[in-house]
């Protein structure tokens, strides 16, 4: 703490503020009749240097002048930028025990003259906003530096405002708090910034601008859209703008989109017609404004207007497929399936589907509406039937899609050849085929149909299908394809009134099955053994089973077992073997094989044939 200088004074030459690299002389003088005793020679003046309240140096050795007992002058050099405190103390040399007494102190500030401010830029937000200018102050001066912003305009008027920088605050922006009005649109303004501190002053170059250069319009507000006659594709966007705006930029996009549609509108006066909107789509709209066609700045984008366009009647055609099952000699069950329209085709919320089944010759018609994407009816097996389905929303219905009901696998000559199914990756399968060899009518399209080979899948799950043009011989199926599951894949070739199909099994990824089949019975018939089993549970198959293997060996034998490999058929659950010796006890077991390998063995059964073996 500095005393209130009762004992003496401290002065600095040339000044308490000096440029970096300069030296200063600090003089400490005692007031008359102040000191240690009546012997002035016992008065010793010392100078202490403090930085950030920490004593860093005793300048005893820096004395350049000493008027014994009354005053001392010290030279200080190499002062760092910022403020340094010097405290003069009186040390009474005849009394070693008493600490030095503070006399007085002084702060010396070391800094630099300000550089000319640069890169001045001014802006006024909105026609009624205020002018604010910012600049680059240059190097830190380490001194209190005053900045004056001066704006000269028409009619020989100049306005100015000041701020300062020091070690607590920085001044590189000033809001003049006054507004340039549109009646000055053509006027030129000159702005300059002057910086002054104890070591010098400097001025920026003058920066010239016009009202239009610096005024950034406020973003448009109160945005709304009016759909003409409740149209889903045409709407009038409306908004409020500042009076001087001559140019607008509109941007709009569906909410899930990543790219904007951009439109420039001149003299729109807060109104613009949009004609290319997608019905029943959530859109985001934003608008920006400019006061001048060529110069000036765009406003910020307005707040978003988010709204959904109205519905329009569905377009496009439904993708229909069907299954036929004979119930008895004169009735069949027809199950129709169709895929939902995509949003750009549905153009609204689909409320229901109109389904029609019609017998072509007798003109029998069955009609119904359903909210589901499937419909099942029992109809006579006789006659030629056709089905049609259309989708309806609040504005109307799509054109009906027709399909002829034919016997899908009834014509062998239409069966595609060399059907193969290859695993492409974890979630798709590549199906390829060759066209029917001797089709007596042209193939109009192929349908690739697939469903998981799991119990009840025909009744529980609708099929998945792809329509393929007649000149394509492959399809990559991915919808609902999961790894380690075997799918039955059918390729249908359809002509106008007939169908032929070929079937194959396939999987997208496989592992060896978890377990082998369970042998349930071994029976002897006509000198042959029949092995019966239950199939491996569906989750344990882990892909398409290619073969079953039946192993056997004599009980207690260490020889390699014999085996019989059976092509996998889902419908088969028993197989004969005929190479076992009578009255020898055998151990039998089974395994299953996928493309990835063989399962562990299933249960073991012992059996001793009785009859005469071949």
């Amino acid at each position: 703490n500095i005393d209130v200088c009762k004992l003496g004074t401290v002065t600095v030459q040339p000044a308490p503020v000096i440029p970096l690299g300069s030296a200063a002389n600090i003089s400490c003088s005692l007031n008359p009749k102040q000191g240690c005793s009546h012997y002035p020679s016992s008065n010793e003046l010392i100078l202490l240097k403090f930085v950030n309240d920490v004593l860093v140096e005793n300048l005893h050795g820096k004395k350049v002048h000493d008027h014994t007992g009354h005053s001392s002058t010290f030279q200080v050099t190499n002062l760092s930028l910022g403020m340094t405190l010097f405290v003069c103390k009186l040390n009474c040399s005849n009394s070693q025990k008493k600490p030095p007494v503070p006399v007085c102190g002084v702060e010396i500030s070391v800094g630099v003259a300000p550089e000319p401010p640069q890169n001045i830029s001014c802006v006024q937000e909105g026609e009624n906003g205020t002018v604010a200018c910012s600049w680059n102050s240059g190097k830190v001066t380490y001194l209190k530096t005053n900045y004056t912003l001066q704006l000269s305009g028409p009619n020989n008027l100049t306005c100015q405002k000041q701020c300062f920088s020091d070690n607590r605050q920085n001044c590189n922006r000033l809001d003049l708090g006054i507004n340039l009005s549109p009646d000055l649109a053509e006027s030129r303004f000159i702005v300059r910034v002057t910086a002054i501190n104890d070591l010098g002053n400097s001025s920026s170059l003058p920066h010239t601008f016009t009202f239009l250069d610096i005024v950034i319009p406020l973003p448009p507000w109160d945005i709304r859209i009016n759909f003409l006659n409740a149209s889903g594709s045409r709407g009038t966007l409306q908004w409020e703008d500042e009076g001087q705006v001559v140019l607008n930029q509109l941007r709009y996009q569906p909410l899930n989109s990543t790219s904007w549609n951009m439109v420039n509108a001149t003299n729109a006066k807060g109104k613009y017609d949009l004609r290319d909107l997608r019905p029943f789509t959530e859109y985001e709209f934003q608008i920006s404004s400019k006061l001048h066609l060529s110069g000036g700045s765009w406003s910020n984008w307005s707040e978003s207007l988010r709204t959904r366009t109205p519905e329009e009647e569905p377009v496009g055609i439904l993708d229909i497929w069907y299954m036929k099952q004979d119930i008895d000699y004169d009735r069949q069950q027809i199950s129709l399936f169709w895929k939902s329209l995509n949003p750009s085709e549905a153009r609204g919320k689909i409320l229901h589907y109109q389904v029609t089944l019609q017998e072509v010759t007798k003109k029998t018609t069955l009609q119904n509406t359903t909210r589901h994407t499937s419909w099942t009816r029992v109809i006579p097996r006789t006659g030629a039937w056709t089905a049609s389905v259309s989708a309806a929303n609040s504005k109307g219905a799509s054109a009906p899609t027709h399909i002829n009901i034919v016997d899908l696998c009834g014509t062998g000559l239409l069966a595609p050849h060399q059907v193969s199914a290859k695993s492409e990756n974890m979630d798709n399968i590549l199906v390829t085929w060759q066209p029917p060899k001797k089709a007596d009518s042209a193939v109009r399209e192929y349908i690739v149909e697939w469903r998981a080979l799991q119990p009840g899948s025909i009744t529980k799950f609708p099929p998945h299908w792809l329509r393929i043009p007649p000149d394509n011989m492959s399809a990559l199926i991915s919808e609902n394809i999961k790894p380690y599951i075997c799918y039955e894949i059918r390729v249908h070739a359809l002509s106008e009134s007939q169908g032929g199909c070929s079937s194959i099994r396939g999987d997208s990824k496989h592992k060896a099955p978890v377990s082998g089949p369970h042998i349930t019975a071994i029976t002897e018939k006509k000198e042959r053994l029949f092995i019966s089993w239950t199939h491996i549970p569906f989750p344990e198959q882990r892909g398409c089973i290619l073969h079953y293997r039946i192993y056997w060996k004599e009980r207690d034998s260490t020889a390699q077992p014999e085996l019989c490999e059976i092509q996998y058929r889902r419908s088969q659950n028993s197989h004969p073997i005929s190479s076992l010796q009578p009255r020898v006890t055998y151990v039998l077991w089974m395994t299953a094989v996928t493309a990835a390998g063989e399962s562990p063995q299933g249960n073991e059964r012992e059996f001793c044939p009785q009859g005469k073996a071949n």
């Epitope: 100015q160 003049l176 708090g177 006054i178």
Partner: nanobody, 125 residues
Framework: QVQLQESGGGSVQAGGSLRLSCAVS????????MGWFRQAPGKEREFVAA???????VYPNSVKGRITISRDNAKNAVDLQMNALKPEDTAVYYC???????????????????WGQGTQVTVSS
């Protein structure tokens, strides 16, 4: 009601200084733009200086550097310091007050709502 009262006018030799003051009652000076105008005999009233509510000063180039306007919120007054006076500065000086926010408006008489009675300044050579 709002009242403005100028003081500090008088006679002075060319090159001398005067400090005019305008005391305001009824409204805080910190909330308004304050201006000084003058009218010489036989001439129109002209703008001398203004101080916006945001403390921005405005001067015509003809007086810039010789005249300083400042606000004293504690006294609810605005002062006009005039240095290096010239005979052509002789006029009646009026203080004015108004809710003005535009650059040009600060120099326009018709933008100010409240006016003082004026104080005479005479500069002799």
């Amino acid at each position: 009601q709002v009242q403005l009262q100028e003081s500090g006018g008088g006679s002075v030799q060319a090159g001398g200084s005067l400090r005019l003051s305008c005391a305001v009652s009824g409204r805080p000076v910190s909330d308004y733009a304050m201006g000084w105008f003058r009218q010489a005999p036989g001439k129109e009233r002209e703008f001398v200086a203004a101080l916006s509510a945001s403390d921005t000063t405005v001067y015509p180039n003809s007086v810039k550097g010789r005249i300083t306007i400042s606000r004293d919120n504690a006294k609810n007054a605005v002062d006009l310091q005039m240095n290096a006076l010239k005979p052509e500065d002789t006029a009646v000086y009026y203080c004015a007050m108004g809710p003005i926010g535009t650059f040009q408006g600060l120099a326009r008489q018709n933008e100010y709502h409240y006016w003082g009675q004026g104080t005479q300044v005479t500069v002799s050579s």
